[in-house]
């Protein structure tokens, strides 16, 4: 009889065990499923108002396929330049081919004419390779012009239809990148 | 308002590894990228590595194929793995979250990696 109580206690423990690791686990379900929601509460927000005018590029940026362009109305250094692309969850300009250039350059003509943009390359102080912010080679086409004789870090910049270089610390208008918004039409 | 943690630093040898972690908490739709800063006692802080919404990186020169920036949106949590370290990555790391034009960026309060045999 002892042992018949003894069985079915240990029955009871053995539910009741599971039944905590049930509840443990719909609790992590629940934790999870809030961050999710989190999560969809956010894109939603930020989608709203890019969804109200169903532009895939923010007001007063420039689309081309699947990219947007931001061009400057300010100055300031290269690496200010990048902290204000960042502002905006976009990047200094990485040219990827020489359409993109073309592109480009022909935009800044109509816009603003011949001035400087910073764009998202730099030379790297030991080996001298120019790089995109990416990690990336330039392709051989789109390496900058030798213009700079600077003993200070060398960065990249457009000018009318070239790619040319000089010191990072000067003041240039810069050009901002980011994906434009795919249609969901 | 956010605000953003970072853990992960401490003491390593020259060519050793470590992941830094930066938590962002509260709200994290106004955050368009983030960031991580160095800074080295008697030095400007300088961004090291940076992530987009869009999930575009970015890296310094000094740091370029030794470093990776990655994020982890289920956790609202972004990371820098750092490999093959060299005594001058010792710093103060910190990261930033980057909000639109014309507003104000929140720091972290930083965490610190010392690199020395």
């Known amino acids: 009889k002892l042992l018949q109580v003894s069985t079915i206690a240990m029955q009871q423990q053995e539910k009741l065990i599971q039944q905590e690791r049930a509840l443990l686990n719909f609790t992590e379900w629940k934790r999870s499923c809030a961050l999710q929601m989190k999560y969809c509460q956010a894109f939603m927000q930020n989608s709203l108002s890019s969804a109200h005018n169903s532009s895939p590029c923010p007001n007063n940026w420039i689309q081309n396929r699947e990219s947007c362009y931001y061009v400057s109305e300010i100055w300031s250094i290269w690496h200010t330049s990048q902290e204000n692309c960042l502002k905006e969850g976009s990047t200094l300009l990485q040219i990827e081919s020489k359409e993109e250039m073309d592109f480009i350059t022909g935009s800044l003509r109509k816009i603003k004419g011949s001035y400087d943009y910073w764009v998202g390359l730099s030379q790297d102080g030991h080996s001298g390779r120019w790089l995109w912010q990416d990690g990336s080679s330039p392709s051989p086409g789109l390496l900058p012009a030798e213009r700079s004789q600077s003993a200070n870090q060398v960065c990249g910049y457009v000018k009318s239809n070239s790619l040319l270089s000089s010191n990072c610390s000067t003041w240039k208008y810069f050009i901002c990148e980011k994906y434009a918004l795919r249609s969901s039409v | 308002q956010v605000q953003l943690q970072e853990s992960g630093g401490g003491r390593v040898q020259p060519g050793g590894s470590l992941r830094l972690s930066c938590a962002a908490i509260g709200s994290i739709f106004e955050i368009n990228s983030i960031g991580w800063y160095r800074q080295a006692p008697g030095k400007q802080r300088e961004l090291v590595a940076a992530?987009?919404?869009?999930?575009?990186?970015n890296y310094a020169n000094s740091v370029q194929g030794r470093s990776t920036i990655s994020r982890d949106n289920v956790n609202n949590t972004v990371y820098l793995q750092m490999n093959s370290l060299k005594p001058e990555d010792s710093a103060v790391y910190y990261c930033k979250g980057f909000t639109g034009w014309g507003k104000e960026d929140y720091w972290g309060q930083g965490t610190q990696v010392t690199v020395s045999s």
């Open positions: 992530i987009t919404s869009g999930g575009i990186t």
